[in-house]
């Protein structure tokens, strides 16, 4: 497993750093699990030709992962703070069933799983102590990804890599569209 | 490999648009963590970054000439465009795009074009 | 806006030497940082990525290292190929760079 934040190789170069600001912890966090997620897609390349598919291709399933749009106030043209902020915890949230059925898909990145599904908590309650308005986010409900979870693990083979693929793949891109904005914060 | 290149016009009259299209080759800007960016150099001055477009189509501008900059994307042509308003004789440089590519968004540009030179 | 500041703006130095270029930001960039070497006519190249990492190519007497605000390039004996201008550039809120170290 990658070291966890706060233990890398860069802070052993500077031991006279500053305590870690918020805004620092929150960015180290997203690229600590951003290290997890590459991690995790080299033992999904390496076991299937999912990789080499074409984004169209892969378009056409019927998972519905939390992607940044401009009307989440994450983008340049119409950027709000507080909108960007609550979409990127609901995104969150929501990733956190799709990143609990990873957790049964990998054998020698078991331990990364885990890893990358503990920081994203660790990160989202980073994210709510910055948030101001914590009643706007909506959490999913428990029922509804139960039923998720007994889906997406009844598919075959075939899915399930497609399905590993994909969570991956747009994990990693929400986080590198929250990363972009919350240095605008 | 990557390759990048600019084109447009070398001379450009006072109060003139500028159109610059930056052709490239060797990866696709649908890539998450994938941005180009477009940069000047005034004869013998520094750099100056002028605006990026990133893989989800956002953008982002210099603030103090964001008024006279637009950059958009043709993914299926593999192409970036700038056009740079209300052209002014300070406005001559060495103009570059360059690509940026990691996890991190680090903006390390990491290949770039020869430049053409606008006066 | 981040505004870069580098030191020296020239610099005077002989083969062999060791040189040391500082880069300053005008507020925390963590270590969103990265160094260029320019020649005359061409485009510039990347050195070094992420305030320490050296970017592929790029020859091991290069070396960078800083956090926060403050960045140094080192290179830590002077070839007749380094004669160039040298700047940084921050990458944690979009990109500035700073106004260019020349070596001569």
């Known amino acids: 497993a990658p070291v966890p934040p706060g233990e890398d190789s860069k802070d052993v170069a500077a031991p006279h750093r500053q305590p870690l600001t918020s805004s620092e912890r929150i960015d180290k966090q997203i690229r600590y699990i951003l290290d997890g997620i590459s991690a995790l897609r080299k033992e999904t390349c390496n076991k299937s030709n999912m990789c080499e598919s074409s984004k169209e291709a892969l378009a056409e399933n019927n998972l519905n992962l939390p992607k940044m749009a401009e009307k989440d106030g994450c983008f340049q043209s119409g950027f709000n703070e507080e909108t960007c902020l609550v979409k990127i915890i609901t995104g969150l949230l929501e990733f956190e069933v799709y990143l609990e059925y990873l957790q049964n898909r990998f054998e020698s990145s078991e331990e990364q799983a885990r890893a990358v599904q503990m920081s994203t908590k660790v990160l989202i309650q980073f994210l709510q102590k910055k948030a101001k308005n914590l009643d706007a986010i909506t959490t999913p409900d428990p029922t509804t990804n139960a039923s998720l979870l007994t889906k997406l693990q009844a598919q075959n083979q075939w899915l399930q890599d497609m399905t590993t693929h994909l969570i991956l793949r747009s994990f990693k891109e929400f986080l590198q569209s929250s990363l972009r904005a919350l240095r605008q914060m | 490999q990557v390759t990048l290149k600019e084109s447009g016009p070398a001379l450009v009259k006072p109060t003139q648009t500028l159109t610059l299209t930056c052709t490239f080759s060797?990866?696709?800007?649908?890539?998450?963590?994938?941005?180009v960016s477009w940069i000047r150099q005034p004869p013998g001055k520094a750099l100056e970054w002028l605006a990026l477009?990133?893989?989800?189509?956002?953008?982002r501008y210099n603030p103090s000439l964001r008024s006279r900059l637009t950059i958009t994307k043709d993914t299926s042509k593999n192409q970036v465009v700038l056009t740079m308003t209300n052209m002014d004789p300070v406005d001559t440089a060495t103009y570059y795009c360059?690509?940026?590519?990691?996890?991190?968004?680090?903006?390390?540009?990491?290949?770039w074009g020869q430049g053409t030179l606008v006066t | 806006d981040i505004v870069m500041t580098q030191s020296p703006s020239s610099l005077s130095a002989s083969v062999g030497d060791r040189v040391t270029i500082t880069c300053r930001a005008s507020?925390?960039?963590?270590?969103?940082l990265n160094w260029y070497q320019q020649k005359p006519g061409k485009a510039p190249k990347l050195l070094v990525h992420s305030a320490s990492t050296l970017q592929s190519g790029a020859p091991s007497r290069f070396s960078g290292s800083g956090y926060g605000t403050e960045f140094t390039l080192i290179i830590s004996s002077l070839q007749p190929d380094d004669f160039a201008t040298y700047y940084c550039?921050?990458?944690?809120?979009?990109?500035?760079f700073g106004p260019g170290t020349k070596l001569e």
């Open positions: 360059a690509r940026s590519y990691d996890d991190y968004l680090y903006y390390a540009l990491d290949y």
């Open positions: 060797g990866f696709s800007l649908t890539t998450s963590g994938m941005c």
């Open positions: 507020r925390n960039i963590n270590t969103y």
């Open positions: 550039q921050q990458g944690y809120n979009t990109l500035t």
């Open positions: 477009i990133y893989w989800d189509d956002d953008k």
